[in-house]
Interface confidence: medium
């Protein structure tokens, strides 16, 4: 008779990573038998949830249960009804919810008790919401990218798993950018790491590892943009700002209440003569450059070197996967390939910004128009963050790897914070059974 | 200790070409930069270009792109550059440095320079 | 290109002299890409300052660095004769790499 595979035996999780702007759900599974070894665990499902972050539910909590509704549901079907008991569920909350709470704690906890009162009525097995700190954010990247790309895994293969993964065991760096935050993390060349808040230590798989990590807050692309108009409005004449960051044409009012709202504009607030402003666009690439450069601090360093507003920042060192809207921005923009060069970026930047309106309106009309006034802004951001910010060059440019998605699973934080949260990266390599993981009888 | 050696002064005609050497020793030669810089007589410096002998990348100056050519052998551990073309214009003595690769700083400056060559243009 | 205008283009200091060069660049540049070279005549240029305010080795530390954004100056606490030579700033935040006009100080 034929051998028959047993049923699989499949464990699954879920991540609901709580951003500033959005909300995504993610599911992933592993094989159980396998759960120590590198590189098994997989997503399945995302599910993007309607509507804004849940920081922007701190006046309608009671709206946070329906609000999570549609992607819950999701995962009982994605998921067999006999694992849901078994299916942890976890809510990591990042750099809008760390906003929140500066501002105030008790309001931050309401919206997390509320989220965790929604959670819990779900058939799965809830382990907690909470406010990740920038660090862990950082970090849990580096864990995804590096486990996804077969990093920590002692076999060295002969194939390669994706077109720019090298055989070598040397570690890829994580850029990270979010709309309110954004991450850099790397393992530095022989280098002493100077401030203990940016240096971590992992022993995965029997390797140890010295980590660098900072994660900024307020220079995530959507913050950052407050950051700049806020600064702008300040030296403006009147309620009108001409902003080379917007294309020829385009028009906004902005309420000035909505812009000393956030915590990251309060270095720029002052009284102005008006309630509200209208932006109206230049489309300038180099003046919007100048203008973001503005944002970062570089004259004051208290370390041997450092990014910027006094953050230690070693050399950088090896490739870089740089993911999340790093990625989302550059994709839009057609700026993701391995053969365009920083220079070619630049000057594509400056024809897309240059563009009129009316123009880009009628060749994206698929895209809404509030996202899409934003990219000429959001693709200089990026150019003068890693610039300027981290200290890339024309030359090291590629090193950056502008990555969506590894074998299928999104870059991101929210595998590595169900990988550390399940137990499922060893601190020492795993012994190598002799016998084969698949059973047949 | 770290040193680059350039060759000896060079008179040549108008239109010839020329190429002109620039011996590494001290140091990892194919973990720098090498630039080459101009300095006409009583002027200031003028960035040509850099070759990695890593990945023998270069990357010119567009004013000196269709006139310099910049190759390394990295078994004798030396850049060159070659000068087409030349006229009066590229008379001048012309300095070969080095300068720290990506991963292996946070300052990119050309930290050791070697002693010139002297290229004179005449007929 | 990134323009680096640097003044003044000529000067003289008597030995315990304050002397401050200015280099005004053309667009905001990070202070870590911007140097500073000596050189004496009839040799070649040597490292300086790095990075706006780092001082080579070998640099006596009269000299200074300082700056941010587009400004930027090396200034030497108390003039000295060997201090006589041209100094250059150079950026590497864009290509073409570019250099000042140069300074010439000379000793009174």
């Known amino acids: 008779t034929q051998n028959k595979a047993l049923p699989e035996n499949v464990k699954y999780g879920i991540v609901l990573d709580a951003g500033s702007s959005h909300t995504s759900l993610y599911i992933y599974k592993w094989p159980a038998e396998k759960e120590n070894d590198t590189g098994v665990v997989h997503q399945v499902e995302e599910c993007r949830v309607k509507g804004p972050g849940i920081s922007k539910f701190v006046q309608k909590v009671n709206e946070i249960g329906i609000y999570l509704t549609d992607c819950m549901e999701r995962a009982r079907e994605v998921i067999p009804r006999s694992q849901h008991q078994e299916t942890p569920v976890y809510l990591g909350a990042t750099a809008g919810m760390r906003l929140l709470r500066m501002e105030s704690e008790e309001l931050a906890d309401r919206v997390l008790d509320v989220v965790e009162r929604s959670l819990s009525n779900y058939p799965f097995d809830f382990q907690g919401a909470r406010i990740i700190t920038g660090q862990e954010e950082g970090a849990y990247g580096w864990i995804t990218i590096n486990y996804l790309l077969g990093k920590f895994s002692q076999k060295t293969r002969w194939f390669s798993i994706v077109p720019y993964e090298t055989n070598n065991q040397e570690t890829f760096g994580a850029l990270d950018l979010g709309g309110a935050s954004t991450q850099v993390t790397f393992v530095p060349q022989n280098q002493t790491i100077e401030s203990p808040d940016n240096a971590l230590q992992f022993r995965l798989y029997g390797k140890d590892y010295n980590v660098y990590t900072h994660s900024f807050l307020c220079y995530g692309k959507d913050q950052a943009l407050w950051q700049k108009l806020a600064k702008d409005i300040q030296v403006a004449s009147n309620e009108i700002l001409r902003d080379p960051c917007f294309h020829p044409g385009y028009k906004k009012v902005v309420n000035v209440s909505d812009l000393y709202k956030t915590p990251c504009t309060k270095r720029f607030e002052m009284t102005l003569p008006f309630q509200q402003f209208e932006i109206q666009g230049i489309g300038n690439y180099q003046q919007c450059h100048q203008s973001i450069l503005e944002l970062f601090n570089t004259s004051y360093c208290p370390y041997s070197q450092c990014a910027f507003n006094g953050i230690f920042l070693p050399p950088l060192q090896g490739d870089f996967g740089a993911f999340s809207a790093f990625y989302f921005v550059m994709k839009f923009l057609n700026l993701t390939s391995e053969k365009v060069s920083q220079e070619k970026v630049t000057e594509m930047m400056k024809k897309f910004c240059a563009q009129p309106w009316e123009e880009i309106k009628t060749s994206y009309a698929g895209v809404k128009e509030k996202y899409l006034s934003e990219y000429c802004f959001s693709g200089t951001y990026i150019l003068s963050l890693l610039l300027q910010g981290y200290h890339f060059t024309a030359d090291s440019w590629e090193h950056i790897h502008f990555i969506g998605k590894i074998q299928g699973s999104d870059a991101g934080w929210t595998l590595g914070y169900m990988l550390n949260l399940t137990n499922m990266i060893p601190a020492e390599q795993p012994l190598s059974t002799p016998l084969s993981h698949s059973t047949y009888v | 200790q770290v040193q680059l050696q350039q060759s000896g002064p060079e008179l040549v005609k108008p239109g010839a070409s020329v190429r002109i050497s620039c011996k590494a020793s001290g140091y990892t030669f194919t973990g720098y930069y090498v630039h080459w810089v101009k300095q006409r007589p009583g002027q200031g410096l003028e960035w040509i270009g850099w070759?990695?002998?890593?990945?023998?990348?270069?990357k010119y100056n567009e004013k000196f792109k269709a006139k310099a050519t910049l190759t390394a052998d990295k078994s004798s551990s030396t850049g060159y550059m070659q000068l087409s073309r030349l006229t009066s214009e590229d008379s001048a003595v012309y300095f070969c440095a080095r300068s720290p690769y990506y991963g292996t700083t946070y300052y990119y400056t050309m930290d050791y320079w070697g002693q010139g060559t002297s290229v004179t243009v005449s007929s | 290109e990134i323009v680096l205008t640097q003044s003044p283009a000529f000067m003289a200091a008597s030995p315990g002299e304050k002397v401050t060069i200015t280099c005004s660049v053309s667009?905001?540049?990070?202070?870590?890409?911007l140097h500073w070279y000596q050189q004496k005549s009839e040799t070649s240029p040597k490292p300086w300052i790095y990075g706006t305010s780092n001082l080579a080795s070998g640099v006596p530390v009269r000299f200074s660095g300082s700056g941010s954004g587009t400004s930027y100056s090396l200034t030497i606490s108390s003039m000295e004769a060997e201090d006589a030579a041209t100094y250059y700033c150079?950026?590497?935040?864009?290509?073409?790499?570019?250099f000042g006009s140069g300074t010439k100080l000379e000793i009174k």
């Open positions: 667009l905001i540049i990070s202070s870590r890409n």
């Open positions: 150079q950026q590497w935040s864009d290509y073409p790499l570019t």
């Open positions: 070759i990695y002998p890593g990945n023998v990348n270069t």
